[in-house]
């Protein structure tokens, strides 16, 4: 899975009147990573592990280019005609990918209230659009507002291209995101459903990569899919993940069932506790 | 590939105990259940029990729960079964077998003739 | 315990012939819990089909399975030479797990 850096911008306008706020976002490797806040932007690492890959005082610089993105994205919805009464957004996602053969991706999207209808490779240079005609004219004004000046257009994009991949190259120097492995911690809980049922629940929280299994198994098989309930794999915040799975059961026949874990090559089994507000909790 | 491979057959007297051996390979020995399955001559297949080898849990048939131990070596990857107070009518062939993803048995052992007799 | 009878015992049939075998549950299983297996002489068992209708990996398409609550089928549509055997079916559902005492299709 590449290393990726993923850059989130959004502006706003109100009536055709493009607001000043903008909103940025910024994740490593899908992880939160920063965030820049409308009014004043000040990018702020997401969790203590922002921080670590960031190290001290070096937001100086991240402030500066979301800054200058806002409001080279403010100035592009001011263009964008015909907007109609009420609030619209602007959204651009760039994105810049390392694979692990050291090749490269990078690419831009933008949505028009939370429609996409304009992408580019940054690398080929090439653009493509959906059909639909709205987004075909959206299209066709934003990519001739970005060419006016063409020059500025080839250096700018060369630009995003080379400084996306020049700061994801600067993050994974930290070695705070090379590759780390992280287990995680399994929780098993249960909790009363009906009346000879029992909702037992098995949690997986502080684990990366995002790569995980997470099942039930009855007698060391596994149960079909219609009779568990998964969660989302989702950032905790703490640059790790969290998920979950459930499923009910008849109360007696606990020992027959196991939360079955894999996680980056290792494996581990976690039983159903005997007791109604007992926790297992264990790493592998 | 994977594979369970089983010790050699074994003939006991009466009052005796006997026990199996079973060595899975190509698989992580703890990321699945041992069960223990047994074959009279001519006969059905009779389940003895299960044992997780992660966290060791045992589930046995009733039936085999006086008389029959699962026990797992985790250094040598090794599950073993150990039926005593033999009597004739154990006369058969021991199976071990893998839990799969969707069945109790998806792979099975060469199967352990014991023979009881005085 | 939930017992499985499997009829009948013994079927007689020639190769392309189609085999239909039976398993009825003395109580009702999901069909999640009901698996067929295969076994030859001298060889052990080996997994055909798993939860009712699924084949395992390698069993050829002639081998089908069908059923729900007390009453499961194994069918082969054609019988190849490899196919006599014993055929046991098998459930997951409720402790102690249980098999079929077997149903030997031989060649007639």
């Known amino acids: 899975e590449p290393h990726s850096l993923r850059y989130n911008l959004t502006v706003l306008s109100w009536d055709g009147s493009v607001q000043s706020g903008f909103l940025t976002e910024v994740h490593l490797d899908g992880q939160p990573f920063l965030r820049c806040d409308r009014q004043k932007c000040r990018a702020k690492p997401q969790g203590q592990w922002a921080e670590d890959v960031l190290g001290n005082k070096t937001w100086d610089r991240e402030t500066r280019d979301l800054t200058g993105n806002g409001k080279d994205l403010r100035m592009t919805l001011a263009h964008i005609k015909d907007q109609k009464e009420g609030l619209h957004s602007l959204q651009e996602i760039r994105v810049c990918e390392i694979h692990e053969d050291n090749s490269t991706r990078s690419s831009q999207h933008f949505y028009y209230d939370g429609e996409l209808f304009l992408s580019q490779n940054l690398e080929t240079k090439e653009w493509t659009m959906p059909q639909s005609s709205r987004a075909q004219t959206l299209a066709m004004n934003v990519r001739n507002f970005l060419k006016e000046d063409a020059m500025k257009t080839k250096t700018h994009y060369h630009a995003m291209h080379a400084d996306c991949l020049q700061e994801l190259r600067r993050y994974l120097k930290s070695g705070v995101v090379l590759r780390r492995t992280v287990p995680p911690m399994v929780n098993v809980t249960r909790s009363e459903a009906s009346e000879g049922n029992i909702t037992v629940t098995c949690r997986a929280s502080g684990f990366y990569p995002w790569n995980i299994t997470l099942s039930w198994r009855q007698d060391g098989v596994s149960l079909s899919h219609d009779t568990q309930q998964w969660g989302d794999v989702l950032p905790d915040g703490n640059g790790t993940y969290q998920t979950w799975v459930a499923t009910r059961i008849c109360q007696g026949e606990e020992q027959r069932f196991t939360c079955y874990m894999e996680h980056s090559g290792n494996h581990s089994t976690h039983p159903v506790p005997s007791g109604k507000v007992l926790v297992l909790q264990s790493h592998w | 590939e994977i594979q369970l491979v089983q010790s050699g057959a074994e003939v006991k007297k009466p009052g005796s105990s006997v026990k199996v051996s079973c060595k899975p390979s190509?698989?992580?020995?703890?990321?699945?259940?041992i069960y223990w399955v047994r074959q009279a001559p001519g006969q059905g297949l009779e389940w003895i029990g299960y044992?997780?080898?992660?966290?060791?849990?045992?589930i046995y048939n009733q039936q085999f729960k006086d008389r029959a131990t699962l026990t797992v070596d985790k250094s040598t990857s090794t599950a073993y079964m150990e039926l005593s107070s033999l009597r004739s009518e154990d006369t058969a062939v021991y199976y071990c077998?893998?839990?799969?993803?969707?069945?109790?048995?998806?792979?099975w052992g060469q199967g352990t003739l014991v023979t009881v007799s005085s | 315990e939930i017992v499985l009878t499997q009829s009948p015992a013994t079927l007689s049939l020639s190769p392309g012939e189609r085999a239909t075998l039976s398993c009825s549950a003395s109580s009702s299983i999901s069909s999640n819990y009901l698996h067929w297996y295969q076994q030859k002489p001298g060889q052990s068992p080996r997994l055909l089909i798993y939860r009712t209708s699924n084949l395992a990996s390698g069993v050829p398409a002639r081998f089908s399975g069908s059923g729900s609550g007390t009453d499961y089928t194994l069918t082969i549509s054609s019988l190849e030479p490899e196919d006599f055997a014993v055929y046991y079916c098998?459930?997951?559902?409720?402790?102690?797990?249980?098999f079929g005492q077997g149903t030997k299709v031989e060649i007639k």
């Open positions: 077998s893998r839990s799969g993803e969707r069945s109790n048995f998806d792979y």
């Open positions: 044992i997780d080898p992660y966290i060791g849990r045992i």
């Open positions: 098998q459930q997951g559902g409720s402790l102690p797990l249980t």
């Open positions: 190509g698989y992580a020995f703890t990321s699945n259940n």
